[in-house]
Interface confidence: medium
């Protein structure tokens, strides 16, 4: 199997950012857990959330109330999450690490860009 994601996700300030992470598995493979983390260079990884295939979403305290699963229907191979109300400080590198059985672990990175629209007065 392999992970499908985007190299760059671009969102306007204040919008919700969908961070995609889909496991394209072979027949019979299942996703056990998806771990999302902020992994900007020079800083330690900061956990966003753990998406457990069986139990659902655990959001780390730093992101409480800001990370959600996309609305149903959900594919059990889809580890995507929503980052609510993006702010400029959210811009950076994110990693999803997917534990599958029986194939093992896969990981992928993406960059989140947050656009700030300036209003011009004439």
């Amino acid at each position: 199997g392999e992970l499908e994601t985007s190299d760059v996700v671009t969102v306007v300030l204040g919008q919700d950012a969908k961070l995609p992470c889909f496991y394209r598995g072979d027949s019979g493979e299942q996703v056990g857990q998806v771990a999302w983390a902020r992994v900007d260079a020079g800083e330690g990884a900061q956990e966003l959330a753990l998406l457990h295939s069986k139990y659902g979403l655990h959001v780390s305290p730093a992101y409480e109330g800001r990370v959600e699963q996309p609305p149903p229907p959900r594919n059990p191979l889809d580890g995507s999450v929503l980052l609510r109300n993006a702010v400029q400080a959210d811009e950076g590198e994110y990693e999803c690490r997917v534990s599958t059985f029986p194939a093992g672990s896969f990981q992928a990175r993406l960059r989140l860009r947050v656009l700030v629209h300036h209003h011009h007065h004439h």
Epitope: G28, E29, K54, Y55, H58
Partner: antibody, heavy 118, light 105 residues
């Protein structure tokens, strides 16, 4: 012998609180997810809550979210379920179970009865 | 959310007879399915995991089969201690099937 010994059930009034305990022995407790599953009188099995081996990740059924708190003390090999704001519909036998994480519940406690009634 | 439907709800049989219990998933769960046995006043007990593997200490008269959406638990020759309620569950869901009660005819 691998076993789970439960305690802490009883009769409580609506709005009250109760804490259930589940003492584990015979296996490396911190290596396993643990779950609470309940069974209302005459009904089927309903998963309530789960916690990862380290205790860092916790999960809840929508029906108990915000009212119940799962925790564990790995130094004491004990699992807990703190139940607040109890309702009549929480009346059930509560089972703790060792959980293979992504698989199945292979070891179960004998259950403890929680009755919520005025 | 995958829904597991068990049938029949009740199965009335005599000791020595063969019991066939069905569990149907609303979408494919591959072979990641378990069966539990529960006797009155007791905790559930894991019987079968991964659709066809017997858990430790489970007698050979219990067997599981199926994959995808249709699964079967077979008890080849019912013993007195087998009269109980049986639940199916798939690995990446917290939901259990509604159960099948096997009672003495």
């Amino acid at each position: 012998e691998v076993q789970l010994v439960q305690s802490g059930g009883g009769l409580v009034k609506p709005g009250g609180s109760l804490r259930l305990s589940c003492a584990a022995s015979g296996f490396t407790f911190s290596d396993y997810y643990m779950s609470w599953v309940r069974q209302a009188p005459g009904k089927g099995l309903e998963w309530v809550s789960a916690i990862s081996g380290s205790g860092g990740s916790t999960y809840y059924a929508d029906s108990v979210k915000g009212r119940f708190t799962i925790s564990r003390d790995n130094s004491k090999n004990t699992l807990y379920l703190q139940m607040n704001s109890l309702r009549a519909e929480d009346t059930a036998v509560y089972y703790c179970a060792r959980d293979e994480g992504y698989y199945y519940m292979d070891v179960w406690g004998k259950g403890t009865t929680v009755t919520v009634s005025s | 959310e995958i829904v597991l439907t068990q049938s029949p709800a009740t199965l009335s049989l005599s000791p020595g007879e063969r019991a066939t219990l069905s569990c149907r998933a609303s979408q494919s769960v591959s072979s990641y399915l378990a069966w539990y046995q529960q006797k009155p006043g007791q905790a559930p007990r894991l019987l079968i995991y991964d659709a066809s593997n017997r858990a430790t200490g489970i007698p050979a008269r219990f067997s599981g089969s199926g994959s995808g959406t249709d699964f079967t638990l077979t008890i080849s020759s019912l013993q007195a201690e087998d009269f109980a309620t049986y639940y199916c569950q798939q690995s990446y869901s917290t939901r259990f099937g509604g159960g099948t009660k096997v009672e003495i005819k």
